[in-house]
C-alpha cells in the first residue's frame, strides 16, 4: 500500500536569466527510493538513479544541474520554460509517486515563491 | 478502478474525416494525458499523439500532423481524436491510452475504422 | 525521432522455458522503456515501465534491464497466457516510438 506523500515547492516563479530549483520531498514512507525522474510533459529532463547515477537529456545539459540532492537546477531560464515540471520517485516496494511544479519565468525583477504544497 | 471506453466501429470513404471518443473514468480527467495509438492491420503500434488536459496543450507525430487534431470536453471527461483526408491506410484500430506522461497504464478497446470505397 | 529496434520478430519455446526479447534504441534514452504484452483483438497491456520497473499486478517471471541503449525484457519461465506479442516503448521524448513487435509463439 502506498503511504507516502509527495511534498513540492508548488507553485514558483522566477526571472528571466536567472534560475531556480525544482525540488521535492517524499515523506510518511519507509520505501526506498531507486530513481527520481524529472520530466515535462513531453520530454525527460533528467534522472538520478541510485546505481547509475544523473543523466541529463542532451537537449538540457548546457543549462541544467543535478541537485542539490535529488532536486534539479534549472538555470539561464526563459519564458519558454514556464510550464509544468513532474517528479517521478521510483520507490520500492510501494511504486511511483509524482509531483507537480508549475514555475513562471517573468520578465520582471517580482518573482516569488508561491507557497508549499502536497500531492498525495 | 480507471476505464477508457471508445466509440464503436465506423467505415469511412476515403476524403472522410473521423471523430472517435473516449470517455474517461476512476480518475480526474484534468490530472493525465490522453495519447492515441494507431494500429494498422497486422501490424504495430504507431503513436500518434496527445492532449494534455488540465492546460489544453496538444502535441502530434510529424507523420499526422495537419490531418489529425485531439481534444477534449472537461464537463464529460471525454477525449476525441479527429483523422481527416482518410485513405486506404488509415485503416487501422485506433487505441487512446494514459498513463505516467508518455508511458500507458491504461488502454480503451480500441477502435475499428475501416476506409473503404 | 528516436528509433527503436526489437529482436527477435518472432520466436518459439514451450512452456516452462527461459525467453529474452532484446530492443535497441538509436540514442541514449537513459531507463525510459517500456514493455508492453499484446494479444489478438486486445489492447495492449503494460508490463515493465522505466526499464526495471514491473507495472502492478504483473507476474514477477516478468523482468527488465538495461539503460542507455540497450534493453531486455526477461520471461522467466513462460507460462501457457504469455503466449502474445511483445512490444517495446521509448518515453524519453515525443514522438513516442514502439520496436515493430516480437510475436511469441508454441514451439
Known amino acids: 500500500m502506498m503511504t507516502g506523500t509527495i511534498e513540492t515547492t508548488g507553485n514558483i516563479s522566477a526571472e528571466k536569466g536567472g534560475s531556480i530549483i525544482l525540488q521535492c520531498h517524499l515523506s510518511s514512507t519507509t520505501a526506498q527510493v531507486t530513481q527520481v525522474n524529472w520530466e515535462q510533459q513531453d520530454q525527460l529532463l533528467a534522472i538520478c538513479n541510485a546505481d547509475l547515477g544523473w543523466h541529463i537529456s542532451p537537449s538540457f545539459k548546457d543549462r541544467v544541474a543535478p541537485g542539490p540532492g535529488l532536486g534539479l537546477t534549472l538555470q539561464s531560464l526563459t519564458v519558454n520554460d514556464t510550464g509544468e515540471y513532474f517528479c517521478i520517485y521510483h520507490t520500492y516496494p510501494d511504486g511511483t509517486y509524482t509531483g507537480r511544479i508549475f514555475l513562471e519565468v517573468l520578465e520582471s525583477s517580482v518573482a516569488e515563491h508561491g507557497a508549499r504544497f502536497q500531492i498525495p | 478502478e480507471v476505464q477508457l471506453v471508445q466509440s464503436g466501429a465506423e467505415v469511412k470513404k476515403p476524403g472522410a474525416t473521423v471523430k472517435i471518443s473516449c470517455k474517461v473514468s476512476g480518475y480526474t480527467f484534468t490530472d493525465h494525458t490522453i495519447h492515441w495509438v494507431q494500429q494498422a492491420p497486422g501490424k504495430g503500434l504507431e503513436w500518434m499523439g496527445y492532449f494534455y488536459p488540465r492546460d489544453g496543450s496538444t502535441k502530434y507525430n510529424e507523420k499526422f500532423k495537419g490531418r489529425v487534431t485531439i481534444t477534449a470536453d472537461t464537463s464529460t471527461d471525454t477525449a476525441y481524436m479527429e483523422l481527416s483526408s482518410l485513405r486506404s491506410e488509415d485503416t487501422a484500430v485506433y487505441y487512446c491510452a494514459t498513463g505516467m506522461l508518455r508511458w500507458f497504464a491504461d488502454w480503451g478497446q480500441g477502435t475499428l475504422i475501416t476506409v473503404s470505397v | 525521432d528516436i528509433q527503436m529496434t526489437q529482436s527477435p520478430s518472432s520466436l518459439s519455446a514451450s512452456v516452462g522455458d527461459r525467453v529474452t526479447i532484446t530492443c535497441k534504441a538509436s540514442q541514449d534514452v537513459s531507463t525510459t522503456v517500456a514493455w508492453y504484452q499484446q494479444k489478438p483483438g486486445k489492447a495492449p497491456k503494460l508490463l515493465i515501465y522505466s526499464a526495471s520497473y514491473r507495472y502492478t499486478g504483473v507476474p514477477s517471471r516478468f523482468s527488465g534491464s538495461g539503460s542507455g541503449t540497450d534493453f531486455t525484457l526477461t520471461i522467466s519461465s513462460l507460462q501457457p497466457e504469455d503466449f502474445a506479442t511483445y512490444y517495446c516503448?521509448?518515453?524519453?521524448?515525443?514522438?513516442?516510438?514502439f520496436g515493430a513487435g516480437t510475436k511469441l509463439e508454441l514451439k
Open positions: 516503448q521509448q518515453h524519453y521524448s515525443t514522438p513516442l516510438t
